[in-house]
């Protein structure tokens, strides 16, 4: 690791759209990239009437918005689809939503992913 930075080599993988995208539904994804590029993990999810539905999780390539983030946290206020990214192996196993608003108390707890129910 450079300057103590946590190198991301693999991330939790999940794809709710796995049949259409022709992928596995879940697993561990090795993160590849050029040597001069940083690698991250990410998660995207929806909040449907208080129920968390994961959309995708996996590797994310060199994005300044993800630098030095050890936790996967969405800070946007009420997006349609939530997104977070982080650095460190499997750092996207847990993700959370702490909107950047003028309140001192966090408004939600970290989410431990549970794949949505499939018929």
């Amino acid at each position: 690791a450079i300057l103590g930075r946590s190198e991301t080599q693999e991330c939790l993988f999940f794809n709710a759209n796995w049949e259409k995208d022709r992928t596995n539904q879940t697993g561990v994804e090795p993160c590849y990239g050029d040597k001069d590029k940083r690698r991250h993990c990410f998660a995207t999810w929806k909040n449907i009437s208080g129920s968390i539905e994961i959309v995708k999780q996996g590797c994310w390539l060199d994005d300044i918005n993800c630098y030095d983030r050890t936790d996967c946290v969405e800070k946007k206020d009420s997006p349609e689809v939530y997104f977070c990214c982080c650095e460190g192996n499997m750092c996207n196993e847990k993700f959370s939503y702490f909107p950047e608003m003028e309140v001192t108390q966090p408004t939600s707890n970290p989410v431990t992913p549970k794949p949505p129910y499939y018929n």
């Epitope: 995208d21 994005d63 997104f83």
Partner: antibody, heavy 120, light 107 residues
Amino acid sequence: EVQLLESGGGLVQPGGSLRLSCAASGFTFSSYSMNWVRQAPGKGLEWVAGINYNGGYKGYADSVKGRFTISRDNSKNTLYLQMNSLRAEDTAVYYCARGANWHDTHLDYWGQGTLVTVSS
Amino acid sequence: DIQMTQSPSSLSASVGDRVTITCRASQSIVRYLNWYQQKPGKAPKLVIYAATSLASGVPSRFSGSGSGTDFTLTISSLQPEDFATYYCQQSYELPLTFGGGTKVEIK
């Protein structure tokens, strides 16, 4: 230096077949997803097909599904596109392009393209 | 399939101008949005990926913004080498789809 070199284009009659190749160098080919993107004369870009780093996942545009097959040989650092039952509307410059992760496919390097002309 | 709509389809500008191109997706694509530059007879070149990240070797006058369905590519001070066609592309799901392109011409 990353290089992608397409070959195999040419003139073919409707209903015919063609196999395009893309020779890759300058990077670890077996670590990247690869894609074919085409551009008809005077038109925009259209994604044709993609394949993940080990060939386990493949995806196709509806317009070519069942007629085109993408494949790769990591031992030869080569990407292929087998095109069957070609139609006039398949006439285009075909580019091979390197992707990042399978689900996050921004195409960071492109070949110079090879022209496929389907005409009688 | 996700439809990508770019506007304008063409624009005329002068060297030094600030140029803004917009791209709208038919559904939320979070930040799975990339921008490419293409010059006549050449292959496309990646300019911006993940909505806001500058690709390697691309000048800092290029920037990207947006998330969800609405995205913008901005060239802060247009240079002679920037006259080209620009395409947006979503990578949220297959099939990957491109916008129709925006041709930036010399005024």
